[in-house]
Interface confidence: medium
């Protein structure tokens, strides 16, 4: 906290300019009018203040706007944004995408900070849903943004926004998140033809149910092993050997290298060894010939 002292004669700031970098903290406090600062915030960003000086400028704005800064000031905060706490940001009402972009630019190249997370949360809540333009902006700055949301938060993403999602945006999503996103993607891309559809839906398939995988196996999609390994185990288990062969196409040979890993390992255990042998890959661990397969989950459902 800077002590209140009178501004020395002749030092009263008439505008925000480079001469202020030579003011001591108490001089900034005493000689810079908060209203002037608010109207010339865009100039602050072009002046190499020290962090201590930025603290004083923030303090002045806090005094002027105890209920939270207006958007006209927020949009021009620039580097001063990094001085804000999540508590400060919770007082703001940010509605303009331009304001959001300006502040994300300040933090560009860094991990998502608590300040940025709070800002995004305030912005999205203010909009009511994660629209395409917002999602475009957020994933451009933070490719992992989508996967940082809870399944509940993801449910507010309209299918139209899915067009903005790139494969790398889903890299860190877990199955629960993909369960929410997959039906939206299916809806968004439903009017595309087979090969184009597969290219778009591929990164969302970690949320696909068995029946959709069966349908894809009829379309010569040649799914790569990396995608197959990300599928839900419970969705893969009911697939037949013939269906998996069709689904993977020439990539089926990759099953051998993955036979000890899920979901391939669990899928092998559910197949007849005879059927596995037809692949000619030397996959072992299937159900021996002559054994009866009891589907206990089906039995429980019937009883």
């Amino acid at each position: 906290e800077v002590e209140k002292t009178a501004c020395p004669s002749g030092k009263k700031a008439r505008e925000i300019d480079e001469s202020l970098i030579f003011y001591k903290k108490w001089e900034l406090e005493a000689c810079v009018d908060a209203a002037l600062l608010a109207t010339q915030m865009d100039r602050v960003n072009a002046i190499p203040f020290t962090y201590e000086q930025l603290d004083v400028l923030k303090h002045k704005l806090d005094e002027l706007y105890p209920q939270g800064y207006p958007e006209s000031v927020i949009q021009h905060l620039g580097y001063l944004f990094l001085k804000m706490s999540p508590e400060d940001i919770r007082k703001w009402n940010v509605t303009s995408l331009e304001t959001l972009k300006a502040l994300l630019e300040v933090n560009k190249g860094h991990e998502m900070s608590p300040q940025v997370a709070t800002l995004i949360d305030r912005f999205v809540k203010g909009r009511g849903q994660l629209d395409k333009d917002t999602l475009d902006t957020l994933t451009a700055f933070y490719p992992g943004y989508l996967c940082s949301l809870s399944p509940e938060e993801l449910s507010s993403v309209p299918p139209s926004s899915i067009w903005a999602v790139r494969p790398q945006d889903l890299d860190t999503c877990d199955p629960r998140q993909l369960d929410v996103l997959y039906p939206k993607a299916r809806l968004a891309f439903q009017n595309m033809n087979g090969s184009e559809y597969f290219v778009k839906i591929q990164s969302f398939l970690g949320g696909a149910p068995t029946e959709d995988l069966k349908a894809l196996s009829q379309q010569n999609v040649s799914m790569d092993l990396a995608t197959f390994m990300k599928l839900r185990t419970d969705a893969v288990l009911p697939l037949t050997v013939a269906e998996v062969q069709k689904l993977l196409g020439p990539h089926v040979e990759g099953l051998k290298a993955e036979e000890r890993h899920r979901p391939v390992r669990d899928w092998i255990l559910r197949q007849r060894q005879d059927d596995l042998d037809t692949l000619g890959l030397g996959l072992q661990g299937g159900i021996p010939n002559g054994y009866l397969v009891l589907d206990l989950s089906m039995q429980e459902a019937l009883s």
């Epitope: 960003n45 072009a46 190499p48 203040f49 020290t50 962090y51 930025l54 580097y79």
Partner: nanobody, 120 residues
């Protein structure tokens, strides 16, 4: 990225010193840079700054006409020529650099350890 100051020392009032700030790990072409000082028991204050292009310089009122800031031809050095030194110039002098000017947001991010100047 490192900044190292040198050239400080003991000098009589009215004398001169030339401080050097050497940057290692980066060149100063795209950096706004400046000299700051801190006297014992006092707050750190700005002395002089120079824009990344070298075309724009600024000075604190207390040193105007006596100190000159400049960038070296080697692209990684900054100088502060101090003439007509006074006892009140006694302080530890720091150089600082800011890469943010292209940002367009920036503040002084990188600081040297300082070099001591005593005028007595």
């Amino acid at each position: 990225l490192q900044l190292v100051e040198s050239g400080g020392g003991l000098v009589q009032p009215g004398g001169s010193l030339r401080l050097t700030c050497a940057a290692s790990g980066f060149t100063l072409d795209n950096y706004a840079i400046g000299w700051f000082r801190q006297a014992p028991g006092k707050e750190r204050e700005g002395v002089s700054s120079i824009s990344s292009s070298g075309g724009s310089t600024n000075y604190a009122d207390s040193v105007k006409g006596r100190f000159t800031i400049s960038k070296g031809n080697a692209r990684n050095t900054l100088y502060l020529q101090m003439n007509s030194l006074k006892p009140e110039d006694t302080a530890v002098y720091f150089c600082a650099a800011s890469p943010r000017q292209l940002g367009p947001y920036y503040a002084m991010d990188y600081w040297g350890q300082g070099t001591s100047v005593t005028v007595s």
